[in-house]
């Protein structure tokens, strides 16, 4: 690894392919700016079970992108 | 079956050096951000060091910057953590962890790694 922090990415890795349904409280899309060259897909759990990041080439997560452009545009 | 081995634990005079390694077996080592953690007698379990072996973030608490450094082998799938300038506070149970799907704002919380290894053993003496 280099020594260095790159970015301010929010994720770490590639994330998970997928999250159970019934674990979604909400998601959140990141789109690339300055801070991220990526897309971010960022899972938050029911019951304060934290955060995951949703492997954004993921099936699952291409859904949820969809779905939040389609109601926010 | 999912395993994480650490080895390289010791007894170490202050000012000293260790190098610990995590042997990760049984996934895919690209897809999981290893971290490793420590527990002292009576204290909490808390994060020292993480990274993920797919996009070279590395991480560090406070205490342990400028002495440790984490690194990898991904031919050997081990992360390794290089601890320098060792103080007797530093001694402590060294756990590695892996996960996938973390953010930095859980990576220094346990309970955000799914996988454990068994431990091994830093003792600092002055």
């Known amino acids: 690894f280099p020594m260095f922090k790159r970015g301010r990415c929010l994720c770490i890795g590639p994330g998970v392919k997928a999250v159970k349904v019934a674990d979604i409280e909400k998601a959140s899309i990141m789109y690339p700016s300055n801070n991220c060259d990526k897309i971010e897909v960022i899972i938050t759990l029911k019951e304060n079970k934290g955060q995951r990041c949703l492997n954004p080439k993921s099936k699952q997560a291409r859904l949820i992108i969809k779905k939040v452009e389609r109601k926010n545009f | 079956e999912v395993q994480l081995v650490e080895s390289g634990g010791g007894l170490v005079q202050a000012g000293g050096s260790l190098r610990l390694s995590c042997a990760a077996s049984?996934?895919?080592?690209?897809?999981?951000?290893i971290g490793w953690f420590r527990q002292a007698p009576g204290k909490e379990r808390e994060g020292v060091s993480c990274?993920?072996?797919?996009?070279?973030?590395?991480y560090y608490a406070d205490s342990v910057k400028g002495r440790f450094t984490i690194s990898s082998d991904n031919a050997k799938n081990t992360v390794y953590l290089q601890m320098n300038s060792l103080k007797p506070e530093d001694t402590a149970v060294y756990y590695c962890?892996?996960?996938?799907?973390?953010?930095?704002?859980?990576?220094?919380?346990?309970?955000?790694?799914?996988?454990w290894g068994q431990g091994t053993q830093v003792t600092v003496s002055s």
């Open positions: 962890a892996a996960t996938q799907g973390l953010t930095i704002a859980t990576m220094w919380n346990p309970v955000s790694y799914d996988y």
């Open positions: 049984g996934f895919t080592f690209d897809d999981y951000a």
């Open positions: 990274c993920s072996s797919s996009d070279g973030s590395t």
